[in-house]
């Protein structure tokens, strides 16, 4: 017997689709070897129709796929738009040839069955309503009209024109006529359930002259839509329940053995397992809404149902829509930390993944808020200005082409703790969730700026120094000027780097920035930070105020740290000043901005590109030139 297992017989009808699952033994070889689906010919040869190597035959083009689920030791063949020509014998199997391990599957596709001409078929989904049309002759106009449901022995009354209603149809069945038409009556049954399915007879009049019509009511559970998503990606359940429930509360629930457990509803209920990674969005007045879940986990796989009811809970006889979600562990989305920890006063650098094929997409960072239906207001984006309350402490660094952008948040407070989403205007599957935890700081920060009360005097020279510990010795240090469009890296002078001694003197590790001469535009937030290649690390921020020299006041004495910095600068005969005006020349260059212009300005995009390519001459000259820039206003 073959160790491969699957359905022996699959039967369907034309136009429908099938999902055939084949199970294989749990071995590493099996998980990684080629999977195939082939059709057996009269000669005994099996012709491949689709395989996991990417092969797809002409007759399956655009209507079939094969997905491997190595974590479940299964693979699935989905075939749509079936025709009778698909009827035949097939094999699903494993191996480099079609003579490997396999399982025989018989597929039969029939024509859609026809019903007797005197029976009218109504096909409705659970929770919907049906209006049954019952024609009659004029002579039966004054007679009693009725609808009954056939049982084994008799026909049980549902409703009649004398206002008799079967108890199980009270509030759900209405018998009526439209306008002046005296040749047809209608019966409307709402909130349909499985139990309503069956054969009905509508009748006008009694005895042999009565008008009768056979009705077959089919009540279907909505077929689950199959959704295949990658681990860590996101999924959107688009729910369209119809205008009749537009004003009811909406919900999404997940089926378990006995019940359907609500994950989220529009009344504020939310399953704690989905905290920080779920939103429910009413779309319009037609009863449409969507639920977005990010950061998919293996345990999110399952059977989901959306619906509407005033209670916000699943209720029999109300419209529903269903999905079967599969979470594939062979994910293209990189495994990143889902929890980032920071301390008060400190900073965090969050690496956000995006589809590397979409490097020019707009990148965003938003904060998930759970109140109401949940929402995620954007805090920063590549073309979105930083929100006012984050002034001076939030920036997004785009690293074109590397599949990651970085969001830095500093001056952390405990109120910053919460959930944040990385998203782009491109591939929505790459939305990821990060939980930021902020603990009270128990020690001094790693980066410290002096002077701390930074007030620069117009027209004079002003130096700020950023002290860093020895553990950052080998990392690249930078200063950048913050604006609500980003933090633009400035030429700087690293004084620790020039010391040739192997030992690291904790007191002398500093990177300085000099404004010479100070102009009004220099006022604002500056960041001192460390990075390694394109990986950003800690930052600290300082606000530099600029004021005019008060008449009669003496020259402001620099602090000891500044004096030390100046000595070091004089020794190297380097003026590490910057021109803010030049820096503003290209505040946010596009991906195709002139390279030379960017390099002259010391723009962050070029800085990132260079530092990510340390082996190139450009990378070398750029990083060393940061010690030798000499700008004047």
């Amino acid at each position: 017997k073959s160790p491969i297992f699957g359905p022996q017989e699959v039967s369907s009808i034309e136009g429908d689709s099938v999902s055939i699952t084949c199970y294989y033994p749990d071995t590493s070889v099996n998980r990684h070897t080629r999977k195939y689906w082939c059709r057996q010919g009269a000669s005994g040869m099996c012709t491949t129709l689709i395989s996991s190597n990417g092969y797809l035959s002409k007759e399956y083009s655009g209507r079939a796929n094969l997905i491997n689920f190595p974590e479940n030791n299964t693979f699935v063949i989905n075939i749509e738009q079936l025709t009778q020509d698909d009827t035949g014998s097939y094999k699903c199997g494993l191996g480099t040839s079609n003579r490997g391990l396999s399982f025989d599957v018989s597929l039969e596709v029939s024509q859609v069955p026809e019903l007797p001409s005197d029976t009218h078929v109504y096909t409705k989904d659970i929770g919907r309503n049906v209006t049954i049309e019952c024609p009659f002759k004029r002579e039966n106009a004054p007679s009693k009209k009725s609808l009954c449901k056939k049982t084994n022995q008799s026909c049980e009354l549902v409703i009649d024109s004398t206002e008799k209603v079967n108890p199980s149809y009270i509030g759900r069945a209405k018998l009526f006529m439209k306008g002046t038409d005296l040749t047809v009556f209608y019966v409307n049954i709402s909130h349909l359930t499985h139990n309503d399915a069956g054969l009905y007879i509508c009748q006008a009049g009694e005895g042999p002259s009565a008008d009768k019509k056979n009705v077959d009511l089919q009540v279907l559970a909505p077929e689950p839509e199959l959704l295949y998503k990658d681990l860590r990606s996101s999924v959107t359940f688009e729910c369209d329940l119809g205008r009749e429930v537009a004003n009811e509360a909406k919900y999404l629930c997940r089926m378990n053995k006995e019940t359907c457990d609500v994950i989220i509803n529009t009344l504020g209920k939310r399953d704690p397992d989905f905290e920080g990674r779920i939103l429910i969005t009413p779309k319009d007045d037609n009863g449409r809404f969507s639920v977005l879940i990010t950061g998919l986990r293996k345990e999110d796989a399952g059977h989901y149902q959306c619906g509407a009811h005033s209670s916000g809970l699943p209720q029999e006889g109300w419209p529903i829509q269903t999905w079967q979600l599969f979470v594939n562990e062979e994910s293209t989305i990189p495994n990143r930390r889902s929890v980032v920890k920071g301390v008060t006063g400190g900073s965090v650098a969050i690496a956000c993944p995006y589809n590397p094929k979409e490097s020019s997409s707009l990148k965003y960072w938003c904060r998930w808020e759970g109140d109401g239906n949940g929402h995620c207001p954007v805090l920063v984006g590549t073309q979105a200005q930083v929100q006012e309350e984050y002034e001076g402490r939030l920036a997004l660094f785009d690293q074109p082409g590397n599949g990651t952008y970085t969001v830095i948040l500093n001056q952390l407070t405990t109120e910053d703790a919460g959930f944040y989403w990385c998203l782009t205007n491109g591939d929505s599957r790459w939305r990821t969730t990060i939980e930021l935890q902020v603990a009270e700081a128990t020690r001094e920060p790693n980066l410290e700026v002096t002077p701390q009360n930074a007030t620069a005097v117009l027209g004079e020279t002003f130096t700020v120094s950023c002290h860093y510990p020895c553990k950052f010795y080998s990392q690249e240090k930078y200063w950048c000027k913050w604006s609500n469009k980003g933090c633009h890296i400035l030429p700087s002078h690293d004084e620790g780097a020039r010391q040739s001694s192997v030992s690291c003197d904790q007191s002398s590790q500093l990177v300085s920035m000099t404004l010479n001469p100070v102009s009004k535009e220099d006022e604002g937030w500056y960041w001192c930070g460390v990075k390694q290649g394109q990986t950003y690390g800690e930052t600290t921020a300082i606000y530099i105020a600029v004021e005019e020299r008060t008449r009669g006041s003496s020259h402001v004495n620099p602090t000891d740290a500044n004096a030390r910095a100046k000595v070091a600068l004089e020794e190297e005969v380097v003026d590490s000043s910057i021109s803010e005006k030049e820096n503003k020349a290209i505040p946010n260059p596009g991906p195709f901005a002139n390279e030379r212009e960017i390099q002259n300005v010391g723009d962050q995009a070029q800085e990132n590109r260079a530092s990510g390519d340390a082996g190139s001459a450009d990378g070398q000259s750029r990083s060393s030139s940061s010690k030798h820039h000499h700008h004047h206003h």
């Epitope: 017989e9 369907s12 429908d16 055939i20 279907l220």
Partner: nanobody, 130 residues
Framework: QVQLVESGGGLVQTGGSLRLSCAAS????????MGWFRQAPGKEREFVAA??????????YVGDSVQGRFTISRDAAGNTVYLQMNSVKPEDTAVYYC?????????????????????WGKGTLVTVSS
């Protein structure tokens, strides 16, 4: 509460036939899959056959030991499942249990695994005499 009731068991001679039925009942219960397992004295529960449906599509699974002899089917309403047992052998003697699933989980879960079925009947005894 969901109930599964098996019927049709009894004594049958080797080579003979028997038809088992399993009816699912319970308010609003509409199964997506139903199946048969069996358990001989002192042995583990063994998969016999299963049937799963989605709209107009039906999937039938049969265990290795009964392939070619036993077939599974269901009624149009989908609440009753049948096991047609032909060419029975003495080793088919066992208590036959009906199982049902309310949630479609075919793709990630192997129907041969008893742990993955949600509802069970009390069983019906089939004895094959030689």
């Amino acid at each position: 509460q969901v109930q599964l009731v098996e019927s049709g068991g009894g004594l049958v001679q080797t080579g003979g036939s028997l038809r088992l039925s399993c009816a699912a009942s319970g308010r609003t219960f509409s199964p997506y899959a139903m199946g048969w397992f069996r358990q001989a004295p002192g042995k583990e529960r063994e998969f016999v056959a299963a049937i799963r449906w989605s709209g107009a599509t039906t999937y039938k699974y049969v265990g290795d030991s009964v392939q070619g002899r036993f077939t599974i089917s269901r009624d149009a309403a989908g609440n009753t499942v049948y096991l047609q047992m032909n060419s029975v052998k003495p080793e088919d003697t066992a208590v036959y249990y009906c199982a049902a699933d309310r949630v479609p989980k075919d793709i990630s879960i192997d129907p041969r695994n008893p742990k993955d079925w949600d509802y069970w009947g009390k069983g019906t005894l089939v004895t094959v005499s030689s």
